[in-house]
């Protein structure tokens, strides 16, 4: 069953997904979709990367981390209850039936009414947006040859630990690793 993640209305939700490129610049296409991963591709695509850059994204959906190092975790800005549901992170490893598919369940809770708003963590301060991950940064100049020559060594995704978007700083320590090969 899919791993569950939580965020409050008005927060930024964080859905973790990682892989390890075999070498710098040897990126693998990734897609994020709303809904469980289908047999092929992603349904209802909200963001997609190619071998060089983020080549498609929709409003409120962006990559926060360094996707060129394999951090393809999805951030959803200012979530509402309608953002609840299952999301698919698909790491599109070249070759037949090689894709790694991860279904992540996002549960949106009503915003808490708190008398001390200063005690709330500023999520976006902890994770400032990187414009380069939204398709406006410099493109990789390396030209990939045959895609199947990419030798992925690892696919990583968070397994069980993250239960609230405000724990995102602890994200890296919670990852389960899947080896390809």
């Amino acid at each position: 069953s899919e791993v569950e993640y939580r965020a409050e209305v008005g927060q930024n939700a964080y859905l973790p997904c990682f892989y390890t490129p075999a070498a710098p610049g040897n990126l693998v296409p990734v897609c994020w979709g709303k809904g469980a991963c289908p047999v092929f591709e992603c349904g209802n695509v909200v963001l997609r990367t190619d071998e060089r850059d983020v080549n498609y994204w929709t409003s409120r959906y962006w990559l926060n981390g360094d996707f060129r190092k394999g951090d393809v975790s999805l951030t959803i800005e200012n979530v509402t209850l309608a953002d609840s549901g299952i999301y698919c992170c698909r790491i599109q490893i070249p070759g037949i039936m090689n894709d790694e598919k991860f279904n992540l369940k996002l549960v949106i809770k009503p915003a808490k009414v708190t008398p001390a708003p200063t005690r709330q963590r500023d999520f976006t301060a902890a994770f400032p947006r990187m414009l380069t991950t939204r398709g406006h940064g410099p493109a990789e100049t390396q030209t990939l040859g045959s895609l199947p020559d990419i030798n992925l060594t690892q696919i990583s995704t968070l397994a069980n630990e993250l239960r609230d978007s405000r724990l995102a700083n602890d994200l890296r320590d919670s990852g389960a690793t899947i080896r390809i090969g």
Epitope: A36, P38, V39, E41, M97
Partner: antibody
Framework: EVQLVESGGGLVQPGGSLRLSCAAS????????MSWVRQAPGKGLEWVAN????????YYVDSVKGRFTISGDNAKNSVYLQMNSLRAEDTAVYYC?????????WGQGTLVTVSS | ETVMTQSPAILSVSPGERATLSCRAS??????LAWYQQKLGQAPRLLIY???TRATGIPARFSGSGSGTEFTLTISSLQSEDFAVYYC?????????FGQGTRLEIK
């Protein structure tokens, strides 16, 4: 208007070969996965094969693997199904369809009859 | 493979009435399910995808619901042109599979 037109069906003996063609129009062919789905006479639908846009990946149902080959030609906006070592159970109407997971639209179909 | 079972095999309904068609998956397919309509001698036509999203040009009287293993196609007020065979199809698990179909006939 999006349109798919199949051709190449006919009567063939067991063990024989046929090549089906599907001509696409009304959309950017190179941007889409294309699929073949078949329907035996009076029976239900069975997904047969599909090809990823650009042709880098091709997938087949087990019953045709090693006998059928799907291919595409972006210059001709066409997808093909080469069928070898045909068997009686391959008798069906073969439909070409756009899409990888769900299929829309479909061509009108072409009948393949495998019989001696 | 994921077996898709449709019920009933034949459904007799009068024009203007509601028709409810069922589709059950042998394992979860989440919401990765489509519905098609096929009239005699014609190719199938996509009605619904993602379990509940109507395809382009499909009238609002067609609606889909369900997730996991249980799905329903509802036609709220049957028109004469709606009498046909209906197929469900899952695209969550390999390989893609269809149900055996439900024939909707005039009562």
């Amino acid at each position: 208007e999006v349109q798919l037109v199949e051709s190449g069906g006919g009567l063939v003996q067991p063990g024989g070969s046929l090549r089906l063609s599907c001509a696409a129009s009304g959309f950017t062919f190179s941007s889409y996965w294309m699929s073949w789905v078949r329907q035996a006479p009076g029976k239900g639908l069975e997904w047969v094969a599909n090809i990823k846009r650009g042709g880098s990946e091709r997938y087949y149902v087990d019953s045709v693997k090693g006998r059928f080959t799907i291919s595409g030609d972006n210059a001709k906006n066409s997808v093909y199904l080469q069928m070898n070592s045909l068997r009686a159970e391959d008798t069906a109407v073969y439909y070409c369809a756009r899409g990888s997971n769900w299929f829309d639209p479909w061509g009108q179909g072409t009948l393949v009859t495998v019989s001696s | 493979e994921t077996v898709m079972t449709q019920s009933p095999a034949i459904l007799s309904v009068s024009p203007g009435e509601r028709a409810t068609l069922s589709c059950r998956a042998s394992q979860s397919v989440y919401s990765n399910l489509a519905w098609y309509q096929q009239k005699l001698g014609q190719a199938p036509r996509l009605l619904i995808y993602d379990a509940s999203t109507r395809a382009t040009g499909i009238p609002a009287r067609f609606s889909g619901s369900g997730s996991g293993t249980e799905f329903t196609l509802t036609i709220s007020s049957l028109q004469s042109e709606d009498f046909a065979v209906y197929y469900c199809q899952q695209y969550n698990n390999w390989p893609i599979t269809f149900g055996q179909g439900t024939r909707l006939e005039i009562k």
